[in-house]
Interface confidence: low
């Protein structure tokens, strides 16, 4: 499996779109800052088999897609940018799915490193809870947008390391 240059370009475009989605200054939302405890250890990539790393990356993309495709999200962001964002994420998920199947075979895929995948799920549940508690305010969404940009950067770095291994 080769995470190609095209995939790398998709990553950069995803981050660029996230940056463009910003609607208010993060500095006006400092009081709303929150530590969502990004499971960084799951993205260090050293202790992982390639297939495990790919399944964690896929979960990250899937949960990001879920988060930004809710009704509340549609109301918070520019529709055109969101559409482009979905397309980029969808393309990345397709690439990663193809890789997982190539690396471990269809049968093994669902059972991959459940603990790492759960850590990612729980991270997104913390984000969802925060948005609920903040009643999906513009500042809450801005904090989440910045957080997702940060976590997507970690994903991008892990993918770079995987490409270097190829």
């Amino acid at each position: 499996c080769n995470l190609s240059q095209t995939h790398s370009l998709n990553n950069r475009r995803t981050l660029m779109l996230m940056a463009q989605m910003r609607r208010i200054s993060p500095f006006s939302c400092l009081k709303d800052r929150h530590d969502f405890e990004f499971p960084q250890e799951e993205f260090d990539g050293n202790q992982f088999q390639k297939a495990q790393a790919i399944s964690v990356l896929h979960e990250m993309m899937q949960q990001t897609f879920n988060l930004f495709s809710t009704k509340n999200s549609s109301a918070a962001w520019d529709e055109t940018l969101l559409e482009k964002f979905y397309i980029e994420l969808f393309q990345q998920m397709n690439d990663l799915e193809a890789c997982v199947i190539q690396e471990v075979g269809v049968e093994e895929t669902p059972l991959m490193n459940e603990d790492s995948i759960l850590a990612v799920k729980k991270y997104f549940q913390r984000i969802t809870l925060y948005l609920m508690e903040k009643k999906y305010s513009p500042c809450a969404w801005e904090v989440v947008r910045a957080e997702i940009m940060r976590s997507l950067s970690f994903s991008t770095n892990l993918q770079k390391r995987l490409r270097r291994k190829d």
Partner: antibody
Framework: EVQLVQAGAEVKAPGESLRISCKVS????????ISWVRQIPGKGLEWMVK????????IYNPSFQGHVSISVDKSITTVYLQWSSLQASDTAIYYC???????????????WGQGTLVAVSS | DIQMTQSPSSLSASVGDSVTITCRAS??????FHWYRQKPGKAPELLIY???NLQTGVPSRFTGSGSGTECTLTITSLQPDDFATYYC?????????FGQGTKLDVR
């Protein structure tokens, strides 16, 4: 095999403190939330509080906030429910439960402890 | 809080019968509906999660359906083990809430 094993029944007087335990085994402790659920004898089920054992992040049902507290000891994979001052109305069976989290972040209670009966009477 | 109302509160049936229990939420909970069975003197056990998914090990005579504000649990071909109390639950909003229970007993 996933197991949640709870401590035995407790009989206490009003005003006393109490801590009940739930020892879990058979899975990675820090991967799943744990909740406590109350059942007053002959009545229905009430969700009280949940905790993420990874970082002790808690969410309380406002009806129970301030009256009970939840905690974990990761070293012995045990979750606790504690009262500093019991009331007769705390008489109930208390269940610890494990949350399963689906792909779309729906959580449900897939494993239950056997329950701990707490009787508060003068 | 989201109120969960089960109907009926009690129900009599015979072995081999089919029964349906309904649960209504005071606001939409999407598919965050779950069903549990509690046998006398025992802890509840999960039957159905996310409105219609059968928990591993639960017989296929249990089926769940619905979403939004209403869901149903149907049990076909009742077995002696099925005479118990059934609870619905929502985990869409905090605090999580249960229905008041439906007691199924032998006619």
């Amino acid at each position: 095999e996933v197991q949640l094993v709870q401590a035995g029944a407790e009989v206490k007087a009003p005003g006393e403190s109490l801590r009940i335990s739930c020892k879990v085994s058979g899975y990675t402790f820090t991967s799943y939330w744990i909740s406590w659920v109350r059942q007053i004898p002959g009545k229905g089920l009430e969700w009280m509080v949940k905790i993420d054992p990874r970082d002790s992040y808690t969410i309380y049902n406002p009806s129970f906030q301030g009256h009970v507290s939840i905690s974990v000891d990761k070293s012995i994979t045990t979750v606790y429910l504690q009262w500093s001052s019991l009331q007769a109305s705390d008489t109930a069976i208390y269940y610890c439960v494990r949350h399963y989290l689906t792909q779309s972040l729906v959580d449900y209670f897939d494993h239950w402890g056997q329950g701990t009966l707490v009787a508060v009477s003068s | 809080d989201i109120q969960m109302t089960q109907s009926p509160s009690s129900l009599s049936a015979s072995v081999g019968d089919s029964v349906t229990i309904t649960c209504r939420a005071s606001q939409s909970v999407s598919n965050y509906f779950h069903w549990y069975r509690q046998k006398p003197g025992k802890a509840p056990e999960l039957l159905i999660y996310s409105a219609s998914n059968l928990q591993t090990g639960v017989p296929s005579r249990f089926t769940g359906s619905g979403s939004g504000t209403e869901c149903t649990l149907t049990i076909t071909s009742l077995q002696p083990d099925d005479f118990a109390t059934y609870y619905c639950q929502q985990t869409h909003g905090y605090p999580f809430t249960f229905g008041q229970g439906t007691k199924l007993d032998v006619r």
